[in-house]
Interface confidence: medium
């Protein structure tokens, strides 16, 4: 992750330290303050890349517009999603609780971090950079970013596990409400996300720097302990492994198991009796899968640029400028896509899930009116309870209605 319009280039310099979700831009500068300003080799400073700041300059304005759009869409979308799940008893169930947790994590990021980011881009400085509140924001900003992305990935993992559990124990009865196991999962997700974000809060500090003969401060990762130096070194790999690969691997494993489970139960009278029920579960599984795919698409460019920077880019290479330009461009696109992920889930649910679509429409117009969700219970086979909705599109069976109220 910066002063009162000292110059155009200074705001670019500040951008270089900007901590976006999951990374700090460190292409143009090192992410920590060197102990001395001695270059590694003779004359290496004389080989620099002139196009760096041009990309940064263009990005400044593009990112401001995108950030403002994400702020509005993310705030309205995630708040509406939370309202829908909170206000409608029929929507209060396991998977929806995880989706609400996902939305709340995104909402916190959108409401707190994005305004700081926009301020930093426009003002070209860290907010309150000369007082203690600025130091507090410097700790809070990356902490909430990592927490938010942690909440996202762990919720996606939990949703994948939940989909497998729903298929593996399809005959389990569940009424309206959030199962205890899901509630424990959500609490654990939030606690773990906060714990994993602690190094960010420790490592990020207000660091003074000189720019064109002026003294400024910026918020950046500044390793002072052995652990923080280690964290800084492995950070890109850790982010890639835990915050990107892990949810994808988790989804792949549990969706493979779920597919095997479904194929194993292909025949049998219960399968025929519960065809609608299974159809609903497939729809929910499809929705969860869609959220994971969107997550992967949003975060892949950023992680790729980080890893390429770590592995391919060589500061001493005389022909590095083209690669640096490409990596910078990729980084900026990646940053916007990654930030977009915090507002895209409600949009995805709107298009993928009929039930959410109906609720979004009614909630945004007025409220998600209860008349649409008048439930009547009908016993079925003595094992499950079918909830009939007056909407002919919804044929919900036990957890399809409560645990799986997405379609």
């Amino acid at each position: 992750d910066n002063p009162e319009r000292y110059s155009t280039n200074l705001s670019n310099h500040v951008d270089d330290f900007t901590t976006f979700r999951g990374t700090e831009l460190s292409f143009l500068v090192t992410t920590h303050q060197p102990t001395n300003l001695v270059l590694p080799s003779n004359g290496s400073m004389h080989n620099y890349c002139p196009q760096q700041t041009k990309i940064t300059s263009a990005f400044k304005y593009i990112n401001t517009v995108i950030s403002c759009t994400i702020f509005i869409v993310g705030m309205v979308g995630n708040a509406t999603l939370l309202r829908i799940i909170y206000q409608n008893k029929c929507m209060r169930n396991g998977p929806n609780a995880l989706i609400a947790s996902l939305a709340l994590g995104d909402l916190i990021y959108v409401v707190i971090d994005l305004p700081i980011n926009v301020f930093k881009l426009l003002a070209g400085r860290w907010p309150f950079d000369h007082n203690d509140f600025g130091v507090f924001l410097c700790k809070l900003f990356p902490f909430l970013q990592k927490s938010s992305v942690g909440i996202t990935v762990l919720n996606l993992c939990a949703l994948s596990v939940d989909r497998y559990r729903a298929v593996a124990s399809w005959s389990r009865v569940q009424g309206i409400g959030i199962p205890l196991v899901t509630a424990i999962e959500i609490v654990s997700i939030w606690i773990l996300s906060f714990i994993l974000a602690i190094p960010e809060a420790i490592g990020f500090v207000m660091v003074p720097f000189e720019y064109r003969g002026e003294q400024h401060k910026t918020c950046m990762l500044n390793a002072t302990s052995k652990f923080m130096e280690f964290y800084q070194d492995v950070k890109d790999w850790w982010l890639f492994g835990f915050y990107f690969c892990m949810p994808l691997v988790c989804t792949a494993i549990f969706y493979t198991l779920m597919t095997c489970e479904m194929l194993n139960r292909r025949n049998g009278s219960l399968r025929i009796a519960l065809s609608e029920h299974l159809k609903q579960r497939r729809e929910v599984a499809k929705t969860v899968f869609c959220l994971v795919v969107i997550f992967a698409l949003c975060w892949f460019p950023l992680h790729l640029s980080r890893i390429l920077k770590k592995t391919v880019y060589n500061e001493m290479d005389k022909n590095r400028c083209e690669l640096l330009s490409f990596l910078l461009l990729m980084d900026y696109i990646g940053i916007n896509l990654a930030t977009m992920n915090s507002c895209i889930n409600p949009i995805a649910l709107y298009f993928v899930s009929k039930k959410f679509k109906n609720c979004f429409q009614s909630c945004l117009c007025c409220c998600c009116y209860q008349s649409k969700s008048l439930m009547t219970s009908v016993p079925m086979n003595g094992t499950s309870i079918q909830w009939k909705n007056h909407d002919q599109n919804n044929h919900n069976t036990d957890r399809s209605s409560h645990k799986d109220s997405m379609n």
Partner: antibody, heavy 126, light 106 residues
């Protein structure tokens, strides 16, 4: 190859306005991280920094001369201009223009005047 | 503004002799630049970022220092090193030069 060449009136009278031009080649002032500055050196004396203009049009002036001097650029023509109003005999010196590079290193920025012109002699005499 | 005081103002050294000149700043600066100027010639960048030699500068030159005290050292004086050396900072506006150290050959 980077070259800078200063041009000026040579001789002028006190209270007149000194106009200097720095014509350069081998680089562009549209390129980020680059700037051009003016430095003067009275005969047998040390160097005195006067003004500087960056690629982003950020301008810096020596506070002791700020009321008198104006720096500007024409990036398309690869020229930087310096105007000193109301000159007196103390302004007699060799005036150099120099390219200044700005490269961020670590968190700080490093600046060097890596190319200099050969200088133009200016004499203020009544 | 930061005042840079160079000492000595004038010094002479024999070929092969070790030479050290200092530059003292009135306030702390992050790094120092050094320029070499010969008579009837424009200054040349000599040392940047306190200790890094500009291209073409012989390895016998070195720079060091921090805070308010910086120095330029020639490990073995040669005839071509006779010149005036200026230190310069831009840690604080305005950028300032030292008055120079004139190095002569004995």
């Amino acid at each position: 190859q980077v070259t800078l060449k200063e041009s000026g009136p040579g001789i002028l009278k006190p209270s007149q306005t000194l106009s200097l031009t720095c014509s350069f080649s081998g680089f562009s002032l549209s390129t980020s991280g680059l700037g051009v500055g003016w430095i003067r050196q009275p005969s047998g004396k040390g160097l005195e920094w006067l003004a500087h203009i960056w690629w982003d049009d950020d301008k810096y002036y020596n506070p002791s001369l700020k009321r008198q001097i104006t720096i500007s650029k024409d990036s398309s023509r690869n020229q930087v201009f310096l105007k000193i109003t109301n000159v007196d005999t103390a302004d007699t010196a060799t005036y150099y223009c120099a390219r200044r590079r700005e490269v961020n290193f670590g968190i700080n920025y490093y600046y060097s005047m890596d190319y200099w012109g050969q200088g133009t002699s200016v004499t203020v005499s009544s | 503004q930061i005042v840079l005081t160079q000492s000595p103002a004038l010094m002479s050294a024999s070929p092969g002799e070790k030479v050290t000149m200092t530059c003292s700043a009135s306030s702390s600066v992050s790094y120092m630049c050094w320029y070499q100027q010969k008579p009837r010639s424009s200054p040349k960048p000599w040392i940047y970022l306190t200790s890094n030699l500009a291209s073409g500068v012989p390895a016998r030159f070195s720079g060091s220092g921090s805070g308010t005290s910086y120095s330029l050292t020639i490990s073995s004086m040669e005839a071509e090193d006779a010149a005036t050396y200026y230190c310069q900072q831009w840690s604080s506006n305005p950028p300032t030069f030292g008055a120079g150290t004139k190095l002569e050959l004995k």
